[in-house]
């Protein structure tokens, strides 16, 4: 891979109601199907058109699902994870990790062992500070006119 790719990592609780055709997405991952290097987590690989997840709009392809109805998805076989979703009932609560790429470079997911995912505040604090300095400088400039 060329260049460094950084990510904004955010977590969200998504509550889905099972539709007529189910929850409406596919998953990859598990201890026996590592989709991401050094990470046996469960990832969303496909959102089905007009399914419950698509209509809700918050779950995205590439999201990592951390838990289902409070049950951790760490260290599960792929089929056990699938079965957990299928048996999750009518109202399903998903704890999800979104990763947004914030720098040019190859698109890909980072494993849990990869340190280059950066927290959102690390980006927002400098941006906010820069904005405040620019605003102050602008006000000073206007006063001089």
């Amino acid at each position: 891979m060329n260049g460094r790719v950084d990510y904004l990592v955010t977590e969200e609780e998504i509550n889905l109601t099972r539709g007529p055709s189910g929850l409406g997405f596919n998953i990859v991952g598990g201890t026996d199907q590592q989709y991401v290097s050094n990470d046996s987590g469960i990832y969303v690989s496909r959102i089905k058109e007009n399914g419950a997840a698509a209509l809700d709009g918050r779950l995205q392809e590439g999201d990592k699902i951390l838990s289902v109805n409070g049950q951790d998805l760490k260290n599960l076989l792929h089929q056990d994870a699938v079965d957990l979703f299928r048996n999750a009932g009518y109202a399903v609560s998903l704890r999800v990790q979104h990763r947004l790429q914030v720098q040019n470079g190859p698109i890909g997911h980072r494993g849990e062992g990869d340190p280059s995912g950066i927290p959102i505040f690390m980006v927002l604090v400098p941006v906010f500070a820069l904005t405040m300095v620019a605003a102050w400088a602008f006000m000073r400039y206007r006063q001089q006119l």
């Epitope: 998953i27 990859v28 690989s45």
Partner: nanobody
């Protein structure tokens, strides 16, 4: 990007055998996460489900019309899925398509529904005389 390529079709006499292959020319390591299927379409007819296989080959499903005659399998190390067709009949004549979806559905399997699959090959012609 997924790029499915079928091969192995041809002209065969009734009672004969053919082995179709479906290779992903593009994917590399993600092939092992695909759920996959074979469909067929005879002239003037709708696309028909033939067989389905899950990501590691541990679960397979067949249309009633091919049960006991066709066998679906896969070799993830070779990025390839197969359809072994034995005891072929004239009514098996069709263009055969392989299809794939990335990952496993968290819903009940509807493996015979073409909408469950995102990627399709161009097809290979099978003619049984």
């Amino acid at each position: 990007e997924v790029q499915l390529v079928e091969s192995g079709g041809g002209l065969v006499q009734a009672g004969g055998s053919l082995r179709l292959s479906c290779a992903d020319a593009a994917s590399g390591r993600t092939f092992s996460t695909y759920t996959m299927g074979w469909f067929r379409q005879a002239p003037g007819k709708e696309r028909e489900f033939v067989a389905h296989i899950n990501w590691d080959g541990s679960n397979t499903y067949y249309a009633d019309s091919v049960k006991g005659r066709f066998t679906i399998s896969r070799d993830n190390a070779k990025n390839t899925m197969y359809l072994q067709m034995n005891s072929l009949k004239p009514e098996d004549t069709a263009v055969y398509y392989c299809a794939a979806a990335i990952g496993s559905t968290v819903d009940s399997y509807r493996h015979s529904d073409p909408l469950e699959y995102d990627y399709w090959g161009q097809g290979t012609q099978v003619t049984v005389s």
